[in-house]
């Protein structure tokens, strides 16, 4: 069946060293356990995280994300997932694309991550 993929229409903000959470869902909501779900960096198409055949495909990740991502899957049966990026770096800032693939049918949604310096302070004077 057909569906749409929905991501945040606003930038997700995270501090360097903290976690970033990038939510994504399909509409109308349906069980996505059997689907392929993933995130890649746009426009470079580097794999950030991939879930296929009911498992995270760690070997397919770009090296700079290896060991730093987690797919929150507790609500995948409702078509809702979140990518958590740990120990956020300045280089993580930019565009991401989330996709859901059901057999040959695929839809995706773009989103943006803004990374901020927790120690940056502007003198109000």
């Amino acid at each position: 069946g057909q569906f749409r993929v929905i991501g945040p229409g606003y930038p997700i903000r995270a501090l360097v060293g903290d976690e970033a959470e990038l939510p994504c869902r399909i509409s109308p909501g349906k069980n996505a356990t059997g689907m392929e779900v993933g995130w890649y960096r746009s426009p470079f198409s580097r794999v950030v995280h991939l879930y296929r055949n009911g498992k995270d495909q760690d070997a397919e990740q770009a090296p700079e994300y290896r060991g730093r991502t987690e797919l929150l899957k507790e609500t995948i049966s409702e078509g809702k997932v979140t990518l958590r990026i740990q120990n956020v770096r300045f280089s993580d800032e930019g565009g991401y694309t989330c996709f859901f693939r059901d057999h040959s049918y695929q839809e995706e949604a773009a989103m943006e991550l803004k990374v901020e310096d927790p120690f940056y302070w502007v003198n109000p004077g």
């Epitope: 749409r4 929905i6 991501g7 945040p8 229409g9 606003y10 997700i12 903000r13 995270a14 501090l15 903290d18 976690e19 970033a20 959470e21 939510p23 994504c24 869902r25 509409s27 109308p28 929150l72 507790e74 609500t75 809702k80 979140t82 958590r84």
Partner: antibody
Framework: QVQLVESGGGLVQPGGSLRLSCAAS????????MNWVRQAPGKGLEWVSA????????YYADSVKGRFTISRDNSKNTLYLQMNSLRAEDTAVYYC????????????WGQGTLVTVSS | DIQLTQSPSSLSASVGDRVTITCRAS??????LAWYQQKPGKAPKLLIY???SLESGVPSRFSGSGSGTDFTLTISSLQPEDFATYYC?????????FGQGTKVDIK
């Protein structure tokens, strides 16, 4: 089943403070963003504040920015709203509501708690 | 901030009538719009999400349409329990604003 129960409302003088709580049950609390929405007597709904599932991101309406603080304790499945420098115009029923990641509608709401700011 | 303007602000109708409420966004919000029903003294109840998807358990007489800036909630045949206030809400970006509401009462 999903349940959201607000508490902490009451009568407070202008300039005073109050902390609202919202106890959640029946779902994986840490996976959901949470919101506070208020409704002044006889008026419409006004979104007040939101917090991400991890608590790392917070958002506020301009009308409460700098005065209200949203927080959550995922170990206690509880959402909070610390309200300082209260004004008469903050008088309202305050509802907590859940959504998924800030990208979904509010599918479950609490019953509301009344905050009255008056001298 | 995105403003939502509902029209009409109130309407009188009879049981069996077809009722249409519109919601206009001040800028495009794709399909990130929901409709809620609220009865006096109660919390709002989600009816429609993503502009046109019917929430589970909501009667099929409720339907939604639209995308971008113009949205519509339709009640195909008004029932006695449908007399209430209806709100639209956008969740495309923060702040997640609501429309001012449309009160549907008995003619």
């Amino acid at each position: 089943q999903v349940q959201l129960v607000e508490s902490g409302g009451g009568l407070v003088q202008p300039g005073g403070s109050l902390r609202l709580s919202c106890a959640a049950s029946g779902f994986a609390f840490r996976n959901y963003a949470m919101n506070w929405v208020r409704q002044a007597p006889g008026k419409g709904l006004e979104w007040v504040s939101a917090i991400s599932g991890s608590g790392g991101s917070t958002y506020y309406a301009d009308s409460v920015k700098g005065r209200f603080t949203i927080s959550r304790d995922n170990s206690k499945n509880t959402l909070y709203l610390q309200m300082n420098s209260l004004r008469a115009e903050d008088t309202a029923v305050y509802y907590c509501a859940r959504d998924y990641g800030g990208i979904s509608p509010f599918d479950y709401w609490g019953q509301g708690t009344l905050v009255t700011v008056s001298s | 901030d995105i403003q939502l303007t509902q029209s009409p602000s109130s309407l009188s109708a009879s049981v069996g009538d077809r009722v249409t409420i519109t919601c206009r966004a001040s800028q495009g919000i794709s399909s990130a719009l929901a409709w809620y029903q609220q009865k006096p003294g109660k919390a709002p109840k989600l009816l429609i999400y993503d502009a046109s998807s019917l929430e589970s358990g909501v009667p099929s007489r409720f339907s939604g349409s639209g995308s971008g800036t113009d949205f519509t909630l339709t009640i195909s045949s008004l029932q006695p329990e449908d007399f209430a206030t209806y709100y639209c809400q956008q969740f495309n970006s923060y702040p997640h604003t609501f429309g001012q509401g449309t009160k549907v009462d008995i003619k």
